[in-house]
C-alpha cells in the first residue's frame, strides 16, 4: 500500500481517492483566489504527460512563502516517488517557458480532472 | 448526527426529464462530497455521481449525457437531473454522504422509488 | 469498470448460525472494498469498510477479511436483526461499483 497523498492524507488511500482530493485542492485554490497568487510568482511550465506529477512537484517547489499552495505541494509529494528538492529540474519541464502560478494551477486542474474522468488514476 | 431525506415525483413519463432532491440535515453539504446511487428492479446498485463541497461534479460515464447534479447551499440540497428517461431508469433512487479521503459511504438517505412510465 | 461479483445470491440460515459471503473483484482491489447491509424499506448501513475495519457501532459478530481480489463477510453467530441484504463495493477507482447482494432468509 502507498500512502498516496503525502502528508495531506489521513494514511493509506486508493489512488482515485487521492486524485480526487487533489483536484478539490486545486478547485479550492482556483475558486478563493482573490489577490495574484502567490503575488504572481513564475514557475517552469510542464509537459503534461507520464511522470507529470514529480514535474508539478518540482516546478512547484520552487515557489516559497506561499501558504496558498503549500497543501498542494504536500498532496503532490504523494504521487512522486523520489523525493524532489528546489532547484531540481526533469525533462519534463518546457524550459524556455515560465507562466504565473495561477495559470500553472488552472492548466494542472483540467488536466487532472480530464485524467479523473477517463478513469487513468494511476 | 448528519441525515439524509431524498423526495421528488414517483412517476414519470418517458423522455421526460426525472428531477429529485436530498435534503440535508445535521451536517452542511460545504463539507464532504454527495453522491446519487440508485437500484433498478432486479439490478445491482449503480453509482452515479458526485458533487463536492466546492461544488465540483463527476458523473459515471455510463450516464455522462443524462445527468447533472447540483446544489443549493442555502437550502443544504443537492439534485439530480435525469434527462430523456425511459423505463432503464425505474429505480429506487438515493442520496449518500462519502467524507473526504474516503472512498465508502457512511450516510445514506432511505431512498425513493421513481417509476418511468406513460 | 470493475465488476464485483457476490455469492450466493441468497442463503437461508437459523439464529445463532455462522454465515460467510464472499464478494470477487474482476481486478486487484487491494483492500478497498466496503460491506453494508440493508433491511426492507430502509437506507443501507454501512458495516465495514477496508475489507475487515468495523464501522463506528458495528457489533463485532461481523467481520470482513481478503485482499487483492476476494473478499469475506462473516457474521460469527447470526441475531434474529441480521436478516437483511449484504453488499460490498469497491473504492478501488470510480465509477465505483456494487455486488448483486447476498439476501440472508430465516431457515
Known amino acids: 500500500l502507498t500512502c498516496l497523498g503525502g502528508f495531506a492524507s489521513p494514511g493509506p488511500v486508493p489512488p482515485s481517492t487521492a486524485l480526487r482530493e487533489l483536484i478539490e485542492e486545486l478547485v479550492n485554490i482556483t475558486q478563493n483566489q482573490k489577490a495574484p497568487l502567490c503575488n504572481g510568482s513564475m514557475v517552469w511550465s510542464i509537459n503534461l504527460t507520464a511522470g507529470m506529477y514529480c514535474a508539478a512537484l518540482e516546478s512547484l517547489i520552487n515557489v516559497s512563502g506561499c501558504s496558498a499552495i503549500e497543501k498542494t505541494q504536500r498532496m503532490l509529494s504523494g504521487f512522486c516517488p523520489h523525493k524532489v528538492s528546489a532547484g531540481q529540474f526533469s525533462s519534463l519541464h518546457v524550459r524556455d517557458t515560465k507562466i504565473e502560478v495561477a495559470q500553472f494551477v488552472k492548466d494542472l486542474l483540467l488536466h487532472l480532472k480530464k485524467l479523473f474522468r477517463e478513469g487513468q488514476f494511476n | 448526527e448528519v441525515q439524509l431525506q431524498e423526495s421528488g415525483p414517483g412517476l414519470v413519463k418517458p423522455s421526460e426529464t426525472l428531477s429529485l432532491t436530498c435534503t440535508v440535515s445535521?451536517?452542511?453539504?460545504?463539507?464532504?462530497?454527495w453522491n446519487w446511487i440508485r437500484k433498478p428492479p432486479g439490478k445491482k446498485l449503480e453509482y452515479m455521481g458526485y458533487?463536492?463541497?466546492?461544488?465540483?461534479?463527476y458523473y459515471n460515464p455510463s450516464l455522462k449525457s443524462q445527468i447533472t447534479i447540483s446544489r443549493d447551499t442555502s437550502k443544504n440540497q443537492l439534485s439530480l437531473k435525469l434527462s430523456s428517461v425511459t423505463a432503464a431508469d425505474t429505480a429506487v433512487y438515493y442520496c449518500?454522504?462519502?467524507?473526504?479521503?474516503?472512498?465508502?459511504?457512511?450516510?445514506w438517505g432511505q431512498g425513493t422509488t421513481v417509476t418511468v412510465s406513460s | 469498470d470493475i465488476q464485483m461479483t457476490q455469492s450466493p445470491s441468497s442463503l437461508s440460515a437459523s439464529v445463532g448460525d455462522r454465515v460467510t459471503i464472499t464478494c470477487h473483484a474482476s481486478?486487484?482491489?487491494?483492500?478497498?472494498l466496503s460491506w453494508y447491509q440493508q433491511k426492507p424499506g430502509k437506507a443501507p448501513k454501512l458495516l465495514i469498510y477496508?475489507?475487515?475495519d468495523l464501522h463506528t457501532g458495528v457489533p463485532s459478530r461481523f467481520s470482513g477479511s481478503g485482499s487483492g481480489t476476494d473478499f469475506t463477510l462473516t457474521i460469527s453467530s447470526l441475531q434474529p436483526e441480521d436478516f437483511a441484504t449484504y453488499y460490498c463495493?469497491?473504492?478501488?477507482?470510480?465509477?465505483?461499483?456494487f455486488g448483486g447482494g447476498t439476501k440472508v432468509e430465516i431457515k
Open positions: 449518500a454522504r462519502l467524507a473526504k479521503w474516503t472512498w465508502y459511504f457512511d450516510i
Open positions: 445535521g451536517g452542511s453539504i460545504t463539507s464532504d462530497y
Open positions: 458533487i463536492s463541497y466546492n461544488g465540483n461534479t
Open positions: 481486478q486487484n482491489i487491494n483492500v478497498w
Open positions: 477496508k475489507a475487515s
Open positions: 463495493q469497491q473504492g478501488q477507482s470510480y465509477p465505483y461499483t
